[in-house]
């Protein structure tokens, strides 16, 4: 994935959660937060932007409560003392449900948006520079964290059942004579246009000269198999696409496909009957020569959730599960626009996709 | 090209129930909120209600709310506003619109509009 | 609810007269202000966006400013196409998350 300079995101971390941001907070960075907030247990949740782990030194302490009608506790805390409450006496989050909720740092305030909407902003009391953290706590499910600097464009993965919490990225192609073991390294800078998470259809909508549109998704969508939907200006280097889901318990295969008109330029393929993780590409209905290699045992198990990540770039796919890059697929079909139609099938539960 | 085409608008009796419908072209129902807006003959524009299918969430204003429900489908790419116990003071015009809400790629701020509108779809409620 | 008044509801202008209508919010909503242009029988267009940002393919004439919670459309010579009634929208969160002013219908005089 290319996140334009970006710190890559944290996928569904565990709460509570502490998180290191990258370079500190800067005029300019928006980081989103996307959630469920839990039905059951507790009347509160928390995100606090602060220096270091120990909780004394809160910049912005943003802490909904399910108290009184509901409310929204806006605060800062120095050197363990808490200051006024400001306090906005409308609830826009919801019990059971999740919630898009977006921090945006100027020079002046925090600016705040949930759902889509300004919910509030908040007048920096303490330099935002001395920030370094971001932590989340309460009654509060997560299913990312994400980092937007200035004058890049958003991508945000939402895995909310992937089992791992840190930035995930592919190495990095070989530069000079040193490479990288494989495993999870920054990723490439590179321009990122639109995303979009959904549930049957993608295709993001353009409002202004260089768009931003934020990913959607609807809430626990039931995902009809085989999913298809289409992937707007089709491939393109630096164009991500992400999916979790659970293998179901007797699964023997699944697939997913990314295929322009009647071709699959890419049918990677998932086989628990050969505990085989099997790539190919059909052209004219006429398969090429099967690809299997895996730099570790199969990713996938029966019964357990995953997610996969695949970028495009200019010469290959790079295909990583779990947070862990897996494997290279270099392009067979080479006019990427034209690889614009996503398929999924077989034996998985899908919980989101990313286009 | 972005479309909205808003449909099934008509005549109902106070009480009674329409389903207005907005089918979008040119983008997803998903990729931004969506909002209804009416506008009563000879007033102005009131906002009715919106949906965030990020995150599911909806809103709608006080005088409708109980009544109508907003909803999509994205199989469909439509949204749909069930509009039930109809009254006189609901005939209006309504209109669907996305509604965009994203940080600027170009600067550090957020911006928000209304960029699409349908052309509207009349519901008359008269006995 | 906040509340966005919009003066004056009506105003009687001339081609190339410098045009200002004005909406007042009850309480501060940030820079989360669009203005719209409607035309009898049409749908609403979006002119500015974020208070003070001109949407793309409307023409430089128009303008929108915002000072506390006052907000500004200037049209600073008005064209024969601008005579049409004019919204201010609020999108800061409250128990109505969006509202609307009462319009400015811009009259040939």
């Known amino acids: 994935m290319a996140f334009s300079g970006s710190q890559a995101p944290y996928l569904s971390p565990a709460v509570p959660f502490s998180g290191t941001i990258q370079g500190g907070l800067q005029d300019g960075l928006q980081i989103t937060v996307n959630g469920t907030v839990l039905s059951s247990s507790g009347t509160r949740f928390a995100v606090n932007f602060q220096t270091g782990f120990s909780g004394n030194d809160i910049a912005f302490h943003f802490n909904p409560r399910f108290e009184d009608g509901g409310y929204v506790v806006c605060n800062t805390r120095q050197n363990g003392s808490w200051g006024p409450e400001e306090r906005k006496t409308h609830m826009p989050f919801q019990k059971g449900m999740p919630f898009d909720l977006c921090f945006l740092v100027q020079s002046s305030d925090f600016k705040v948006m949930v759902n889509g909407i300004l919910f509030v902003q908040y007048f920096h009391r303490v330099p935002f520079h001395r920030v370094d953290t971001i932590s989340v706590n309460g009654s509060v499910q997560l299913s990312y964290i994400s980092f937007q600097n200035p004058r890049t464009v958003p991508v945000q993965p939402a895995f909310s059942t992937v089992p791992f919490s840190q930035p995930v990225c592919f190495p990095p192609r070989p530069r000079g004579r040193r490479q990288k073991p494989p495993g999870v390294w920054p990723a490439n800078p590179a321009p990122i246009t639109q995303t979009v998470i959904h549930t049957v259809q993608s295709a993001p909508g353009q409002m202004f000269s260089t768009p931003a549109i934020p990913p959607m998704m609807y809430p626990h969508p039931a995902y009809p198999m085989p999913f298809i939907t289409t992937i707007l200006g089709g491939l393109y280097p630096s164009k991500s696409i992400l999916l979790s889901g659970t293998v179901l318990p007797s699964a023997q295969r699944f697939h997913i496909n990314l295929c322009s008109g009647n071709h699959i330029a890419f049918h990677l393929n998932p086989r628990f009957d050969e505990n085989a993780v099997v790539r190919n590409t059909q052209i004219d209905n006429s398969w090429g020569s099967e690809e299997r290699s895996l730099p570790r045992k199969m990713p996938f198990v029966r019964g357990q959730s995953f997610s996969v990540w695949i970028l495009c770039e200019a010469h290959c796919l790079k295909v990583a599960v779990d947070g862990q890059h897996l494997f290279e697929y270099y392009h067979r079909l080479r006019n990427l626009p034209t690889i614009n139609r996503l398929e999924v099938g077989g034996d998985i539960q899908l919980t989101h996709v990313q286009t | 090209e972005v479309q909205l085409v808003e449909s099934g608008g008509g005549l109902v009796q106070p009480g009674g129930s329409l389903r207005l419908s907005c089918a979008a072209s040119g983008f997803t129902v998903s990729s931004s909120s969506i909002h209804w807006v009416r506008q009563a003959p000879g007033k102005g524009l009131e906002w009715v209600a919106y949906?965030?299918?990020?995150?599911?969430?909806?809103s709608y204003a006080d005088s409708v709310k109980g009544r109508f429900t907003i909803s999509a489908d994205t199989s469909k790419n439509t949204a749909y506003l069930q509009m039930n116990s109809l009254r006189a003071e609901d005939t209006a015009v309504y209109y669907c619109?996305?509604?965009?809400?994203?940080?600027?790629?170009?600067?550090?701020?957020?911006?928000?509009?209304?960029?699409?509108w349908g052309q509207g779809t009349l519901v008359t409620v008269s006995s | 609810d906040i509340q966005m008044t919009q003066s004056p509801s009506s105003l009687s202008a001339s081609v190339g007269d410098r045009v200002t209508i004005t909406c007042r919010a009850s309480?501060?909503?940030?820079?989360?202000v669009a203005w719209y242009q409607q035309k009898p029988g049409k749908a609403p267009k979006l002119l500015i966006y974020s208070a003070s940002s001109l949407y793309s393919g409307v023409p430089s004439r128009f303008s929108g400013s915002r000072s506390g919670t006052d907000f500004t459309l200037t049209i600073s010579s008005l064209q024969p196409e601008d005579f049409a009634t004019y919204y201010c929208?609020?999108?800061?969160?409250?128990?109505?998350?969006?509202?609307f002013g009462q319009g400015t219908k811009v009259e040939i005089k």
């Open positions: 309480q501060s909503v940030s820079s989360a």
């Open positions: 619109a996305r509604y965009s809400t994203y940080s600027s790629s170009s600067s550090s701020k957020w911006v928000w509009g209304m960029d699409y």
């Open positions: 929208q609020q999108s800061y969160y409250d128990s109505n998350p969006i509202t």
């Open positions: 949906i965030y299918p990020y995150s599911g969430y909806t």
